[in-house]
Amino acid sequence: SERCDDWGLDTMRQIQVFEDEPARIKCPLFEHFLKFNYSTAHSAGLTLIWYWTRQDRDLEEPINFRLPENRISKEKDVLWFRPTLLNDTGNYTCMLRNTTYCSKVAFPLEVVQKDSCFNSPMKLPVHKLYIEYGIQRITCPNVDGYFPSSVKPTITWYMGCYKIQNFNNVIPEGMNLSFLIALISNNGNYTCVVTYPENGRTFHLTRTLTVKVVGSPKNAVPPVIHSPNDHVVYEKEPGEELLIPCTVYFSFLMDSRNEVWWTIDGKKPDDITIDVTINESISHSRTEDETRTQILSIKKVTSEDLKRSYVCHARSAKGEVAKAAKVKQKVPAPRYTVELACGFGAT
């Protein structure tokens, strides 16, 4: 066949759907690869063709759109499963073409099983709630387009295995789940099961997300440098190893970039000739506050190095701070036989 612009296998679009549930999958060409939408393509006389390769097979085959009850169908740029089966897992390709133009992309579709407590290999979206921040809501995700607005589905919410009913601080409100006051104990997986009728059949959509309770912006502060501080002096003799930790606490801030860096005599370590190494470690609290430690290390410090200015800097969306380390050269202890003896007037 003639040349076709092949975008390959789009592994960024690893699509996971639950077994025995409806799934609507849009052809990724129009969302990520082409500069025009399906309607424009269709108006220009282009045809969208679907085919697939089963799991553990190499053979591309057409999708059977003649299954009982139209189990698999195509509508505009959407491939529909009503519902999915486990063996629908495979790589799906959508190809847009006419006699002069061709473009195609493949993507993996994985049909996964869930247990009665909604555990599955599904990668779960994470929704962050602020701790003790007043009423916050999560919304049942990715259910648009499955049923018309005239259809009123029933929605049941679960926390793990348990139906959310008469919970004292979590209230189901249709597509939303309201947390009256989010606490660490609210961390976990929450599932909405949306049940709707279609052509005399009943379908279920299961959507699970992970709730993570994080520090509230009400309590957020600029970075706090715990070390270096005024109480610790780094006193070294030339030839010894100099180790200075910079330990900084960052309040959790949504989408904030936390940065820690050292300057030596006002320059970044990379811009000076000293043999410096910097090792960083990061730890998080239960509410995702962050503590970053950067240890500045000079293996064999010189007397020149001990005169330099070592400053730890930190920055977040809340502000920027800096703290200098107190570094000094250790005065060598007097050698008794010479210095002390001379001091006592010995000859």
């Epitope: 407590c117 004292n168 104990s185």
Partner: antibody
């Protein structure tokens, strides 16, 4: 490590009530579900209901609805099961049990059991 | 509610032999099934969950299989400490229900 320690054996008259306690240690009490399961002499295990202390949520088997009340005291990390209108067939060992998380349906941890004897 | 039926009620086996215990659900429970061991005067102890996953610290001689309505617990070579009562439990539907138990006794 997780431990569930239950209150001692009880002898009760028919028509009365019994309240069995289950003190939990190891893990944050409010973050888990606590269930009650009973076992009549020589019989199998029977699920009665449970509680999620952090949410004040309770759930009961239909058979025991209205006769069993499960509560929890977060300050002492203790779950309670009260069974009222006792009859002789309620003679059983009552166990509290805890799944490892909200998302697991099996019991990793069990109390030692409390024998409740109902006799006139 | 889902009824769990275990068979046989009693299984007489010699130490070192293989024991096969059966559990049947009145409707499909997928793989949402656990097995427990109970010795006289003790609380049950979790052996298997998810129909085939061994719980922490459970010896490899215990294995579970099956899905849907038919499940099996196999003890490959019975040790003296394995003589006990075994229960299956489904957690696919509320209320979670247990079988009546299989007693494994020394032949």
């Amino acid at each position: 490590q997780v431990q569930l320690v239950q209150s001692g054996a009880e002898v009760k008259k028919p028509g009365s009530s019994v309240k069995v306690s289950c003190k939990a240690s190891g893990g944050v009490f409010s973050y888990y579900a606590f269930h009650w399961v009973r076992q009549a002499p020589g019989q199998g295990l029977e699920w009665m209901g449970g509680i999620i202390p952090g949410y004040g949520a309770t759930f009961y088997a239909q058979k025991f609805q209205g006769r069993v009340t499960i509560t929890a005291d977060e300050s002492t990390s203790t779950a309670y099961m009260e069974l009222s209108s006792l009859r002789s067939e309620d003679t059983a060992v009552y166990y509290c049990a805890r799944p490892v998380s909200y998302s697991s349906g099996w019991y990793d941890y069990w109390g030692q059991g409390t024998l409740v004897t109902v006799s006139s | 509610e889902i009824v769990m039926t275990q068979s046989p009620a009693t299984l007489s086996v010699s130490p070192g032999e293989r024991a096969t215990l059966s559990c049947r659900a009145s409707q499909s429970v997928s793989s949402n099934l656990a097995w427990y061991q109970q010795k006289p005067g003790q609380a049950p102890r979790l052996l298997i969950y998810g129909a085939s996953t061994r719980a922490t610290g459970i010896p490899a001689r215990f294995s579970g299989s099956g899905s849907g309505t038919e499940f099996t617990l196999t003890i490959s070579s019975l040790q003296s400490e394995d003589f006990a009562v075994y229960y299956c439990q489904q957690y696919n539907n509320w209320p979670w229900t247990f079988g009546q138990g299989t007693k494994v006794e020394i032949k």
